[in-house]
């Protein structure tokens, strides 16, 4: 059904790192817009993005309202130039978005290693704990603010004459590992929710390695 | 050093709602440590129902998840409890804990390392 | 759930004997997560090692854990009067968390 001149949408994909969520589509539009609508599975639709020549939406604002909700979106296709225009069933086109529960699938986005401080034969490593878009008393949380204790971190870390890597872990976002004194080591760490099935880990961060700027040394 | 307090009715009628609060003295509840609640049915073992984060980001036993709320109020320096529908087999001791990072293999970790003292919860008509 | 099965349920044993209390898991747990508390009757528990064998600050050294995996163990090299109560095992690494059982010293 719908007008001759337009088409549904379809690919319709969730793009979400650590909880910007953007909706992304096909096909470019010919002759036509897109409005796309939101809704959790027992709310109101909320219409965002209007008649849009974008194949994206934005719709990290609604899902950072409870990012443990499930979401579902639709794309509705409008002739260009004539979005009153409906299909023959009365509406217009529209395609569903797969659903979408932001605390289970957001990715974890590439953590970054905040500094290094040896005091001997120890090292003190700190990720960075990032801001996310999610609001509580007006104030952005960060990722550990939002996920607790599902969150941890793996640290890798090899002395930097050799490959052989050693891990740790962490429920916090601090590491204190045991190195040989006089070596030089390098550092890079990982964000895992163990509990999740899917997008349970981020990429690796940028190699840290003892001897460059972030790091500091103390006997 | 940090002490908790539980506080609540002892007594609570069959399918309404308990509740309790703990309250956190000689420290921030906004840390860094998460705050929890136990409770020992008489005579036996402990039963984990659930934590909060000062964020507010919990986690629950799923045999409770449907009846439970676990609340945060930082300018209060408590974390409350609330149980729906109660029935005789509700009836515990419950006690509040923080749960502390510790230091192990290179990370840290966190343990239930200060208790409140229990407060004993009777649901009856 | 992680199940956790301490045994045996009662030990009876006498002041300065040595107790091996066993906790076994119903699958593996990263020893990471495992603690053991003491309760004594009345009383809240209290930690005693975390980290499957590590101490907690004060708890005297005739405590000791032990063990990985599924098996765990915590030992009291020489019972004082003041050890008898009731011993958890608990793991946090999986919600939920879980104690197991307990395993209560008496004195014999």
């Known amino acids: 059904s719908g007008t001759t001149n337009t088409v549904a949408a379809y690919n319709l994909t969730w793009k979400s790192t650590n909880f910007k969520t953007i909706l992304e589509w096909e096909p470019k539009p010919v002759n036509q817009v897109y409005t796309v609508q939101i809704s959790t599975k027992s709310g109101d639709w909320k219409s965002k993005c209007f008649y849009t020549t974008d194949t994206e939406c934005d719709l990290t604002d609604e899902i950072v309202k409870d990012v443990n909700q499930t979401y579902l979106a639709r794309v509705f296709s409008y002739p260009a130039g004539n979005v009153e225009s409906t299909g023959s069933a009365g509406e217009p086109l529209y395609e569903n978005s797969p659903e979408f529960t932001p605390y289970l699938e957001t990715n974890l986005g590439q953590p970054t290693i905040q500094s290094f401080e040896q005091v001997g034969t120890k090292v003190n490593v700190t990720v960075e704990d990032e801001r996310t878009l999610v609001r509580r008393n007006n104030t952005f949380l960060s990722l550990r603010d939002v996920f607790g204790k599902d969150l941890i971190y793996t640290l890798y870390y090899w002395k930097s004459s050799s490959s052989g890597k050693k891990t740790a872990k962490t429920n916090t976002n601090e590491f204190l590992i045991d190195v040989d004194k006089g070596e030089n080591y390098c550092f890079s760490v990982q964000a895992v929710i163990p509990s999740r099935t899917v997008n349970r880990k981020s990429t690796d961060s940028p190699v840290e390695c003892m001897g460059q700027e972030k790091g500091e040394f103390r006997e | 050093q940090v002490q908790l307090q539980e506080s609540g009715p002892g007594l609570v009628k069959p399918s309404q709602t308990l509740s309790l609060t703990c309250t956190v003295s000689?420290?921030?509840?906004?840390?860094?440590?998460?705050w929890s609640w136990i409770r020992q049915h008489p005579g036996k073992g402990l039963e984990w129902i659930g934590e909060?984060?000062?964020?507010?980001?919990?986690r629950y036993n799923p045999s409770l998840k449907s009846r439970v709320t676990i609340s945060v109020d930082t300018s209060k320096n408590q974390f409350s409890l609330k149980l729906s529908s109660v029935t005789a087999a509700d009836t515990a001791v419950y006690y509040c804990?923080?749960?502390?990072?510790?230091?192990?293999?290179?990370?840290?970790?966190?343990?239930?390392?200060?208790w409140g003292k229990g407060t004993t919860v009777t649901v009856s008509s | 759930e992680i199940v956790l099965t301490q045994s045996p349920g009662t030990l009876s044993l006498s002041p300065g004997e040595r107790a091996t209390l066993s906790c076994r898991a119903s699958?593996?747990?990263?020893?990471?997560?495992l603690a053991w508390y003491q309760q004594k009757p009345g009383q809240a528990p209290r930690l005693l090692i975390y980290?499957?064998?590590t101490r907690q600050t004060g708890i005297p050294d005739r405590f000791s854990g032990s063990g990985s995996g599924t098996d765990f163990t915590l030992t009291i090299s020489r019972l004082e009067p003041e050890d008898f109560a009731v011993y958890y095992c608990?793991?946090?690494?999986?919600?939920?968390?879980?104690f197991g059982g307990g395993t209560k010293v008496e004195i014999k």
């Open positions: 909060i984060y000062y964020s507010g980001s919990t």
């Open positions: 804990a923080r749960d502390a990072p510790y230091y192990y293999g290179g990370g840290y970790y966190y343990y239930m390392d200060v």
């Open positions: 608990q793991q946090a690494g999986v919600v939920p968390y879980t």
């Open positions: 980290g499957a064998s």
């Open positions: 699958e593996s747990v990263d020893s990471s997560y």
């Open positions: 000689g420290g921030s509840i906004s840390s860094g440590q998460y």
